[in-house]
Amino acid sequence: ALDTNYCFSSTEKNCCVRQLYIDFRKDLGWKWIHEPKGYHANFCLGPCPYIWSLDTQYSKVLALYNQHNPGASAAPCCVPQALEPLPIVYYVGRKPKVEQLSNMIVRSCKCS
Amino acid sequence: ALDTNYCFSSTEKNCCVRQLYIDFRKDLGWKWIHEPKGYHANFCLGPCPYIWSLDTQYSKVLALYNQHNPGASAAPCCVPQALEPLPIVYYVGRKPKVEQLSNMIVRSCKCS
């Protein structure tokens, strides 16, 4: 699987999950989150050659098409597969509230 | 929705479904399919700016990150959303067989 275990410990050139830290204030302009100040969101990057973690029958066909037509702009793209939630603390006035923001962290990628 | 109805009738620059015809023999090297000789597979293409058909909470965050950090390589990607099957005819010896190949045609796209 193209997950953090594999991707973070390798020098994989093809589609893989990459490290990305997002600072809520600086990178998103969000002032309302109190904790954490930012988080490891990660992102997906890398080419999707034929047979590389292809998601559907269509992505297999497209990768094969791309192999036969190397100059074509039609190609599968490396996108998130498994996403995880992020617990945050925000304030309503002076009162802290805990919330789970769903689908915030990329754990693995796929070619779609 | 970024579907064929909208995308094929517009000059949309952002993520949208585009026309692509795949010839089974020429483009895939598949000789086993008897009918059709090829099909309109379509593909997804175009940038994913902020608020453009974003798929998950993560893709919203990533697009917003990208807006604040325009030079970053982390950005959502335009990928298939709705896929449809393709009925095909192939031969087993001299006997024709009809099969549905699932997830073969792109009907709409999303930013993931």
Epitope: L28, G29, W30, K31, W32, Y90, Y91, V92, G93, R94, K95, E99, L101 | Y50, I51, Q57, K60, V61, L64, Q67
Partner: antibody, heavy 120, light 108 residues
Framework: EVQLVESGGDLVKPGGSLRLSCVAS????????ISWVRQAPGQGLEWMGG????????NYAQRFKGRVTLTADTSTNTVYMELSNLRTEDTAVYYC?????????????WGQGTLVTVSS | EIVMTQSPASLSLSQEEKVTITCRAS???????LAWYQQKPGQAPKLLIY???SRAPGVPSRFSGSGSGTDFSFTISSLEPEDVAVYYC?????????FGQGTKLEIK
Amino acid sequence: EVQLVESGGDLVKPGGSLRLSCVASGFTFSSNVISWVRQAPGQGLEWMGGVIPIVDIANYAQRFKGRVTLTADTSTNTVYMELSNLRTEDTAVYYCARTLGLVLDAMDYWGQGTLVTVSS
Amino acid sequence: EIVMTQSPASLSLSQEEKVTITCRASQSLGSSYLAWYQQKPGQAPKLLIYGASSRAPGVPSRFSGSGSGTDFSFTISSLEPEDVAVYYCQQYADSPITFGQGTKLEIK
């Protein structure tokens, strides 16, 4: 230029419901918090609730809980306020406003307001 | 909920006079959870002061705010004709946000 434009105000019968819209432009909608405040004719200001558009987290004034629902659509930069079981005392101008960034905060930009009249 | 009591309810002063409006909270707001607004007839409120004493961008320097805890004040150092309006204080320390009942300012 920062702009908030409310719409959907109407004459409604008691017991009815209404959906008001607030369309934002000129700023990064999803980095902000939007509040709704109403003002009955000749009266003061009353905060109803606020929503964080990108995550759809809403906070309401206790007296409106169960009767008001705030939602957001980041694809159209719109916040919606649904108000149900309307009473004559809900007659007011309804404003949406951008906060300075926190859920409860000062509000630096306001819409022009939309008038809701509840009468039989 | 926190009750905000504004005084006076109305005020009539001459041009260039100093204006002071006070706002008392039913419980302590700390030092920074208070704002002041100006509302002219037929218009939406306009933010003047936030954090008890910070002027909003573009607000003239004749407007100022001070205070902490339960007692806050708003001052216009020299009254101008365009300052005729209703002024509101607002607390945002606790939910729900609450406003004072307003002070109507007129020119003699």
